[in-house]
Interface confidence: medium
């Protein structure tokens, strides 16, 4: 491979590590979605409340004269609880409120997989760089881009899990905005599918330049 | 199904006393807040009181206030309004309505999305 | 006597538009969600809009909702003869710490 084409593996696998570490951070964050209640009548306090993939966390918040409850980074007496995924005999209404189990369990079993493919890209980019085995890039980019995907589905399938919730007549909130982890993991879908096409494309073999030329002629990469 | 069934109306004198039900089937009962409007004759509708989830927070018309009670039994998913020192004017055909949902804060609303077939009190000497 | 103010009556004829008004105060409708209840001869009360312009299942996209500050409308679009009901606002009204409804409007269908 060239000094060219491995400067731009490398600053790709750079993306992609960054791509890594903000999937990592989303996934075992609970801040993709924050929610606020309304009341027509409330307690000197709201619930307002936060989630990712794995719990979710509700915080009493002192409430003013006006209808808005928040932000959530005030200071509150925090309670959290994990969504219970596995365990399907156990009731699933936490803090008085039923949860979008069927969402949360797609989208953590997708989070999954992700991670699945992350580690597998990550073991054909380890395996490519100690024995020069350049040709063990290309599946390492499919994998990443795999992975990119699934956190993309993980996305929406929050996004839907929070339009559901919002709508529902069967929790107090009613506002919402995407958090910090919901950030993250657009950003390392980004990163991961954009850096694993890349990748793709710096790890195949040189087209041929002349019509006379096969693939077989091309340079060889190491 | 969500359904409410109101019971307990009639013919009672004026400084008389009457104790409304509504019994509630189909949905969480004490996740909700509830409420009693009224509608006397030829008149539109009057709000009358509502009780949040827990039973613990209550609120009242200012025509009703001092004489009637609202309470709720959520292990018998019912709720109650207790009417004392009636008047002529609280002649109405009473409703039971399910309002919106209540956490320990305080509830969504209050506004009724189901409605039961209403009761009679007819208070006349 | 009401805090929310409808007119007390309105009319048209099948398929034409008809609005009905509620007015409030910043207390009551400026600071909170409206409603809309529809009231047929001889039945009980039923939700037609609830958070301002959110319709039930069940209730056709002919009927719509609007806010705008202290005062909001109910839209009737290609009226039926079936519409022909009681219609009130209603909204929680914090000063009173309690529900407030409209006077009501009695549609006609002409």
């Known amino acids: 491979m060239s000094q060219t084409k491995m400067l731009k593996v490398r600053v790709t696998l750079f993306c992609i590590l960054a791509g890594i570490v903000l999937a990592m951070t989303a996934v075992v964050t609970d801040h993709w979605a924050v929610l606020s209640p309304h009341m027509e009548h409330h307690n000197t306090t709201c619930e307002a409340a936060h989630f990712g993939l794995w719990r979710i966390c509700t915080k009493r918040i002192p409430m003013d004269d006006s209808k808005t409850c928040g932000p959530i980074t005030l200071p509150g007496e925090k309670n959290c609880s994990y969504f219970r995924h596995f365990n399907p005999g156990e009731s699933s209404e936490i803090f008085e409120f039923t949860t979008q189990k069927e969402y949360s369990i797609s989208a953590a079993a997708i989070a999954i997989f992700s991670l699945g493919f992350i580690i597998l890209g990550s073991l054909c980019v380890l395996l490519s760089l100690g024995k020069k085995r350049d040709y063990l890039l290309r599946p390492a980019s499919m994998f990443y881009a795999f992975a990119g995907l699934c956190i993309l589905v993980s996305v929406e399938v929050m996004r839907q899990s929070v339009k559901r919730m919002i709508d529902s007549e069967d929790t107090v909130w009613i506002e919402y905005y995407y958090s910090w982890s919901f950030a993250c993991a657009c950003a390392a879908f980004i990163l991961l599918f954009l850096g694993g096409l890349a990748l793709l494309l710096f790890s195949l073999p040189r087209m041929p330049r002349n019509p006379w030329e096969s693939c077989m002629d091309a340079e060889p990469e190491h | 199904e969500v359904q409410l069934l109101e019971s307990g109306g009639g013919l009672v004198q004026p400084g008389g006393s009457l104790r409304l039900s509504c019994a509630a089937s189909?949905?969480?009962?004490?996740?909700?807040?509830m409420s009693w409007v009224r509608q006397g004759p030829g008149k539109g509708l009057e709000w009358v009181s509502s009780i949040s989830g827990s039973g613990g927070t209550t609120f009242y018309a200012d025509s009703v206030k001092g004489r009637f009670t609202i309470s709720r039994d959520n292990s018998k998913n019912t709720l109650y309004l207790q009417m004392n020192s009636l008047r002529a004017e609280d002649t109405a055909v009473y409703y039971c309505?399910?309002?919106?949902?209540?956490?320990?804060?305080?509830?969504?609303?209050?506004?009724?999305?189901?409605w039961g077939q209403g009761t009679t009190v007819t208070v006349s000497s | 006597q009401s805090v929310l103010t409808q007119p007390p009556s309105a009319s048209g004829t099948p398929g034409q538009r008809v609005t009905i008004s509620c007015s409030g105060s910043?207390?009551?409708?400026?600071?909170?969600?409206i409603y809309w209840y529809q009231r047929l001869p001889g039945t009980t009360p039923k939700l037609l809009i609830y958070?301002?312009?959110q319709r039930p299942s069940g209730v056709p996209d002919r009927f719509s909702g609007s806010k705008s500050g202290t005062s909001a409308s109910l839209a009737i679009s290609g009226l039926r003869s079936e519409d022909e009901a009681d219609y009130y606002c209603a909204a929680w009204d914090d000063t009173l710490s309690g529900y407030v409804f409209g006077t009501g409007t009695k549609v006609t269908v002409l």
């Open positions: 189909g949905f969480t009962f004490n996740n909700y807040g």
């Open positions: 910043s207390s009551n409708i400026g600071n909170n969600y």
């Open positions: 309505g399910k309002g919106g949902y209540c956490s320990s804060s305080g509830c969504r609303h209050y506004g009724m999305d189901v």
């Open positions: 958070r301002n312009n």
